[in-house]
């Protein structure tokens, strides 16, 4: 996250990270016991989780192996359409004050609606500073149409824009995958942004949850 | 289909400047995600990348040249510009403009001009 | 900077076979390995981004594979057009370098 601040501690319990070894790979988000949500562009062979904790690398954390994810059918590794997929645990977590689900979407949120983006991703662009602590951000949701002026062709229709005019603040490297929360409800995933991260008035891009419900409940119960 | 053209002259004389534009066509050159490049490749050499710049006016140099170079953008014209400070023969090389998408997810040069062959001699 | 190491500088190999460079980088660059082809006289042309993905209309013998440090470039049959220069470019970090090329010629 770049120019956003340290999380107040445990108010983000749906925050996980997605760990390649004990390296952050990415963010996620807990939506049922057995199963995260992330980025489709963050899938690997296999998952290390870590949950309930908002140090990256906590040894009191809970983590988890994951073997099994699943990708959007339609996602496009050149154009990030439909980069969404449901990553399964190889067993269920201990749900407590610090691991709870998010709550998913029961409406698209409006342009104009704050709300909060997290992640481990990298404070600095180009060169890269990794933080220990959970980082936030406070946002806006942007309109398709004026974020289609910065991106033009490259926004998608499921995609969604936030950002603060003229501010830095922004997602990063390290923060794929992770949650945008409005008004308490899981509205976006971390998708992209422009690189070096933290271009005034470039929006981050996210995908947009509310648009994937169906799909999300659906492959939850075919692969129970 | 975006198109990148360069120009400018092929004959620079030693200590002076170099000066090169791009002019972009079939695209914009404000749009987001896309920065705009100046490469080089020395004769029967590799390719060396010299730096970049946003619609914005944001720049990225390469160190290696940082202190010489400077690129700037036009975005009423769809063009960028190379200016290259105290050429030496070194210099000579084929200067290449393209267009690089970087996004945190992926970057990568996909569209390049035909490249202009400047040489430094007196 | 990243420096980009890539072997061989140039091969000669039979119409038809399986051609190999390789590619390794300094530090890890995670996957923001891209590839390019350049023939005589002509600018680079992308073929494959962020190591294995096959840019829009590059012919299927082309493939790329790897992450971190250590990446492949394949020409699964080669063919008389693809007699070129090719190079490895890192783009996880400023300031973007290159390899030294791969001459492939046709024996």
């Known amino acids: 996250i770049i120019d956003g601040y340290k999380c107040k501690e445990g108010s983000h319990p749906w925050q996980v990270a997605l760990l390649k070894g004990n390296q952050l790979h990415c963010g996620g988000v807990l939506v049922d016991k057995y199963w995260v949500l992330t980025a489709a562009h963050c899938k690997m062979g296999q998952y290390q989780v870590q949950l309930g904790s908002d140090k990256i690398g906590d040894q009191s954390a809970q983590k988890i192996k994951a073997t099994k994810s699943f990708r959007h059918p339609g996602y496009s590794t050149k154009t990030h359409v439909n980069d969404i997929m449901l990553v399964r645990l190889d067993e269920p977590v201990k749900m407590s004050s610090k691991v709870e689900a998010v709550q998913l979407p029961e409406h698209c949120e409006p342009p104009g609606t704050s709300c909060t983006v997290s992640g481990w991703g990298t404070t600095t662009s180009p060169d890269v500073t990794f933080p220990s602590d959970l980082m936030c951000s406070d946002v806006k949701l942007i309109s398709s149409r004026e974020c289609k002026k910065v991106y033009k062709d490259l926004l998608g229709k499921t995609m969604l824009c936030a950002g603060i005019p003229d501010s830095k603040t922004n997602t990063c490297n390290g923060d794929s995958g992770g949650p945008l929360v409005c008004n308490d409800t899981l509205q976006g995933l971390v998708s992209w942004g422009t690189y070096p991260c933290g271009q005034p008035n470039d929006p981050g891009v996210y995908t947009q949850v509310c648009k994937y419900k169906r799909w999300v409940m659906e492959t939850m119960k075919t692969h129970r | 289909q975006v198109q990148l053209q360069e120009s400018g002259p092929g004959l620079v004389k030693p200590s002076q400047t170099l000066s090169l534009t791009c002019t972009v066509s079939?695209?914009?050159?404000?749009?987001?995600?896309?920065?705009w490049s100046w490469i080089r490749q020395h004769p029967g050499k590799g390719l060396e990348w010299i730096g970049s710049?946003?619609?914005?006016?944001?720049?990225y140099y390469n160190p290696s040249l940082k202190s010489r170079v400077t690129i700037s953008v036009d975005t009423s014209k769809n063009q960028f510009s190379l200016k290259l400070s105290s050429v030496t023969a070194a210099d000579t090389a084929v200067y290449y403009c393209?267009?690089?998408?970087?996004?945190?997810?992926?970057?990568?040069?996909?569209?390049w001009g035909q490249g202009t062959l400047v040489t430094v001699s007196s | 900077d990243i420096q980009m190491t890539q072997s061989p500088s140039s091969l000669s190999a039979s119409v038809g076979d399986r051609v190999t460079i390789t590619c390794q980088a300094s530090?890890?660059?995670?996957?923001?390995l891209n590839w390019y082809q350049q023939k005589p006289g002509k600018a680079p042309k992308l073929l494959i981004y962020?190591?294995?993905n096959l840019e829009t209309g590059v012919p299927s013998r082309f493939s790329g594979s790897g992450s971190g440090t250590d990446f492949t470039f394949t020409i699964s049959s080669l063919q008389p057009e693809d007699i070129a220069t090719y190079y490895c470019?890192?783009?996880?970090?400023?300031?973007?370098?290159f390899g030294g090329g791969t001459k492939v010629e046709i024996k």
């Open positions: 470019q890192q783009a996880s970090d400023l300031p973007f370098t």
């Open positions: 530090q890890d660059i995670a996957n923001y």
């Open positions: 393209a267009r690089a998408k970087q996004l945190t997810t992926h970057r990568y040069f996909d569209y």
């Open positions: 079939g695209g914009s050159i404000s749009s987001g995600g896309y920065y």
């Open positions: 962020d190591a294995s």
């Open positions: 710049i946003y619609y914005s006016g944001s720049t």
